[in-house]
Structures are given as structure tokens and as C-alpha cells.
């Protein structure tokens, strides 16, 4: 806290402007009246304050508004939204997209702040759900955004917000949240034909079902290992040896480098090892012949 | 990578006015604030003042205000500065510098300095 | 104008050894100061700014410690390429002023 002291004489802003850059923190304080500030707040982000004199700036604009900042400040915050804590943040309205993007370019380059992480959250509650533009927006300025958000969160993102959404937004995606993705992501590409809905849906292949990896099987696909190592265990497994070679094409070869890794190693061990054989690959580690499968699970079931 | 390119080594006459320019490459030239800090043989640093190239807006410390002018040309990405009524105290080495964050004006890259000598 | 006292002006280490630059300002200035090392010749180069965070590529072997009025620069073990002269700026408020610069040199 800046000790209240009276202004020198001469002082006074009566405007916001670059001279208010050599005033001390306690000539700030006493110099600068609130109303003025929130008035003139687009002039202060085009002065270089430094950051111990936005402490004072921020101090005044607390005591004008107790409740919590009007947008019309919010929006021209600049610099000073560095200053501002998630509790501050708890208290604004922000509705205007503009404003969400003003302060996202503050931040611009850094991780995402506890402060950005609020803004957003209440940004998005305000709107009541992921809509496009908001997630353009989002995955621009911080593409591991959707992989942030908890599956009960990521299921209000409508479809059609799929659009936006980049192969590298879903790096850090975990299987939990590609479930919900996945379906969303069918239903947006599903007047798509097939080479070019392949494109589109392959990122969020680590949550699609078995019967949907079995039709792309019959697409001439071509998937390439990475993707397929990002498919669910459970999905794979099903899968016959004449599916998973259809599904890779010519990247089948990549098996052979992948065999100890899930969900490859796996695979392999629900095959038959004579069927392996016929990819001439030297996988390793089916079921050998004359042995009896029993799906007990699909026994169990039917009991 | 971020390069500020200063003009060569001047001689002036006390009472005469000198230039320098400070040319900018690998970054937006008009995204940050171009600053002016000079060094005196063998003394500190003294930092002068600041331009943005993208409004012209500038602020002069008060030690030189009305003998400096900071200017840039934006279409060459060039900042300049211009010192007047020169003593021979102004004989130093004037660096331009760009500070990334304005918040944190802390000096994040440096021309390679000009020195300018101001003898009779 | 805050005014940024430097020393010792100038400072002699063995290799290996610890060098110690200290700065004090004329008021309070948070933990708004940077350093910076100047080899001859060159313009100054940013080591430490947030009074001890280190500037992206700057070996740990120099430190920065210090708040409100009272810093330091601690180079670990000397090197060499050390040699240099060694300035603190503060930048709490403007205008922003730095030190005289501490010279150091191998004893």
C-alpha cells in the first residue's frame, strides 16, 4: 500500500498521459484521480508504466470499483491484467470477445497463467458453451487449451466447433477426453468423402470404437503408425490381422519396430501366429497353432 | 534473430547537433518501445529516453529534453536520434536498445554503440 | 531519481573463486533490478533481471540475490571469460538509472 500524502503543487494529471511515467509511486497515489484513470484507461497500455507503477494504478481502480471492474475497463486493461489475481478476475462480466482477446495478447508467448485460466473459465460459463469463434480464439493463443479442459467440460463443445480445431491442439489429449471429441468430431465431418474425412478426423482417432476403425479398414486409409499407437487398446484388439493391414497400407511394415509397445504388443497376442506370418514381418508372440480362443469375456455376457 | 545496426563513429564541434541511426531487423520494429542510453569514457550508462515507432510517441528524460529528438522511419525499420547544442561532456558511446515487456524495462537487446566525440 | 551505488569499482578473483558485486539503491525498489555484464569493446549484455532470475542462456554460475534496497551478483566459480565490467539497473521507476559498473579482473 502507497501512503496517502497530498499532491505537490503543480502535479495533478489532469489527463493520463507519458509525463505520469517519472511520477513516484506516492505522487501516482496522490496525483492520478480514479475516475480519471477508468475514464482514460485505453491512454494508459500506450504508456510504458512499469510494473511496481501499475501496483498504484490497480490499487485506484480496486477502490473505485470494489465490485468487481466494469468491461469498458476490462478491455483496455493492457499490462495492467498482469497485476490482476484469479479472485479479482472472479468478480468481472467479460461477454465481449474483443476484450477476451485484448487480454490473451498480454499473456502472449507465456504458459497459461492461473489469471488467463479464470478469464477464460468465466468467459466461457458467461456464454454457456464452447462456441467456434471463442475456440478459435483459444486454440490460437494456446493450443493445448481443449486437452486442458475435463471431459464433463469438453462436452459442451457443439460439433461444429470441431472446425477449428488443429491436429497439434490435441497433442496432450488424453484417451478420457478423445472419447468425448470423437463423436463430435464424426458428426462435424460426416458429409466429408472419404479421403478428405480421414484428414479431418485422424487426430482424434484415440477415441473411436472398434467398428469405426473396421470401416476406415475398407477406405484404403493408409494410417500411419503414429496415429495408430494414439488408438485405444480396446479398439485394436479386436481387430483380425487382414483389418490392421488394411488400415496401415504400406506403413503395416512399422509394426515390426513397434512390437513391444502398446497397443501393438497387445495386438499381437490375441492373433493367431500363423495369420501374423502372413504379413512376413517376423512379429512374434500369437497364439500358436491348434491352441482354442475362448472369449471369455463374451461368454460371461451371455450368461 | 534481433539485430539493431548503428551508424559509424562521428567528430563533432561543440555547438553542433549529431544523428545516429539504429537500424532493426528480426523482430516487428514496431512493436516495442526504441530506447537511447549513452556511456561517457570509462563511466556508467545514462539512459536518455524512448520512442514507439508505431504511434511516435516519445518520452525524453528531463536531463535532455528540448536538446533531444527521437525519431524513426518505419517504412526502413530504423530508429534515429538527434542530439543538439553538443558539449564536450556529450563525448560518449549512445547505444540503442529495445525492451521486449514495457512493464520490465530491463534492456533485452543492444545496438553495437556509436561513439560520437565532441572536441573543439 | 533513484540512484544506483555500486561497489568495490573495480574487483580482483582468482579462477575458481567466488566474486561478490554488491548494489544499493536510494529507495526501495522492489525487486525491479537487472544486471548487466559489458566486455570491452561491446555493448552490454543482460544477465539477471527480476533481481535474480537468470536471462535465457546465462550459466548458473552467476546468481542474483537481494530486495528492496540492497543486491548482489554472485559469480560461483570465476571463469576466464568473466572478465568483464558488471553494471545494475533499476527499473522500479523512471528514469531508469544504473550503477557505475564494477570492473572485474583476474587476480
Known amino acids: 500500500e502507497v501512503e496517502k500524502t497530498a499532491c505537490p503543487s503543480g502535479k495533478k494529471a489532469r489527463e493520463i498521459d507519458e509525463s505520469l511515467i517519472f511520477y513516484k509511486k506516492w505522487e501516482l497515489e496522490a496525483c492520478v484521480d480514479a475516475a480519471l484513470l477508468a475514464t482514460q484507461m485505453d491512454r494508459v497500455n500506450a504508456i510504458p508504466f512499469t510494473y511496481e507503477q501499475l501496483d498504484v494504478l490497480k490499487h485506484k481502480l480496486d477502490e473505485l470499483y470494489p465490485q468487481g471492474y466494469p468491461e469498458s475497463v476490462i478491455q483496455h486493461l493492457g499490462y495492467l491484467f498482469l497485476k490482476m489475481s484469479p479472485e479479482d478476475i472472479r468478480k468481472w462480466n467479460v461477454t465481449s470477445l474483443e476484450t477476451l482477446k485484448a487480454l490473451l495478447e498480454v499473456n502472449k508467448g507465456h504458459e497459461m497463467s492461473p489469471q488467463v485460466a479464470t478469464l477464460i473459465d468465466r468467459f466461457v460459463k458467461g456464454r454457456g458453451q464452447l462456441d467456434k469463434d471463442t475456440l478459435d480464439t483459444l486454440t490460437a493463443f494456446y493450443p493445448g487449451y481443449l486437452c486442458s479442459l475435463s471431459p464433463e467440460e469438453l462436452s459442451s463443445v457443439p460439433p461444429s466447433s470441431i472446425w477449428a480445431v488443429r491436429p497439434q491442439d490435441l497433442d496432450t489429449c488424453d484417451p478420457r477426453q478423445l472419447d468425448v471429441l470423437y463423436p463430435k468430431a464424426r458428426l462435424a465431418f460426416q458429409n466429408m468423402n472419404g479421403s478428405e474425412y480421414f484428414v479431418k478426423i485422424q487426430s482424434f482417432l484415440g477415441g473411436a470404437p472398434t467398428e469405426d476403425l473396421k470401416a476406415l479398414s475398407q477406405q484404403n486409409v493408409s494410417m500411419d503408425l503414429a496415429t495408430f499407437m494414439k488408438l485405444r487398446t480396446d479398439a485394436v484388439l479386436p481387430l483380425t490381422v487382414a483389418e490392421v493391414q488394411k488400415l496401415l497400407g504400406p506403413h503395416v511394415e512399422g509394426l515390426k519396430a513397434e512390437e513391444r509397445h502398446r497397443p501393438v504388443r497387445d495386438w499381437i497376442l490375441r492373433q493367431r501366429q500363423d495369420d501374423l506370418d502372413t504379413l512376413g514381418l517376423g512379429l512374434q508372440g500369437g497364439i500358436p497353432n491348434g491352441y482354442l480362443v475362448l472369449d471369455l469375456s463374451m461368454q460371461e455376457a451371455l450368461s | 534473430q534481433v539485430q539493431l545496426v548503428q551508424s559509424g563513429a562521428e567528430v563533432k564541434k561543440p555547438g553542433a547537433s549529431v544523428k545516429v541511426s539504429c537500424k532493426a531487423s528480426?523482430?516487428?520494429?514496431?512493436?516495442?518501445?526504441m530506447h537511447w542510453v549513452r556511456q561517457a569514457p570509462g563511466q556508467g550508462l545514462e539512459w536518455m529516453g524512448m520512442i514507439h515507432p508505431n504511434s511516435d510517441n516519445t518520452i525524453y528524460y528531463e536531463k535532455f529534453q528540448g536538446r533531444v529528438t527521437m525519431t524513426v522511419d518505419k517504412s526502413i525499420s530504423t530508429a534515429y536520434m538527434e542530439l543538439s547544442r553538443l558539449r564536450s561532456d556529450d563525448t560518449a558511446v549512445y547505444y540503442c536498445a529495445i525492451i521486449i515487456t514495457p512493464v520490465v524495462p530491463k534492456f533485452d537487446y543492444w545496438g553495437q554503440g556509436t561513439l560520437v566525440t565532441v572536441s573543439s | 531519481d533513484i540512484v544506483m551505488t555500486q561497489s568495490p569499482d573495480s574487483l580482483a578473483v582468482s579462477l575458481g573463486e567466488r566474486a561478490t558485486i554488491n548494489c544499493k539503491a536510494s529507495?526501495?525498489?522492489?525487486?525491479?533490478v537487472a544486471w548487466y555484464q559489458q566486455k570491452p569493446g561491446q555493448s552490454p549484455k543482460l544477465l539477471i533481471y527480476w533481481a535474480s532470475t537468470r536471462h535465457t542462456g546465462v550459466p548458473d554460475r552467476f546468481t542474483g540475490s537481494g530486495s528492496g534496497t540492497d543486491f548482489t551478483l554472485t559469480i560461483s566459480s570465476l571463469q576466464a571469460e568473466d572478465v568483464a565490467v558488471y553494471f545494475c539497473q533499476q527499473y522500479s521507476s523512471y528514469p531508469l538509472t544504473f550503477g557505475a559498473g564494477t570492473k572485474l579482473e583476474i587476480k
Open positions: 528480426g523482430y516487428t520494429f514496431t512493436s516495442y518501445w
Open positions: 529507495h526501495s525498489v522492489g525487486t525491479s
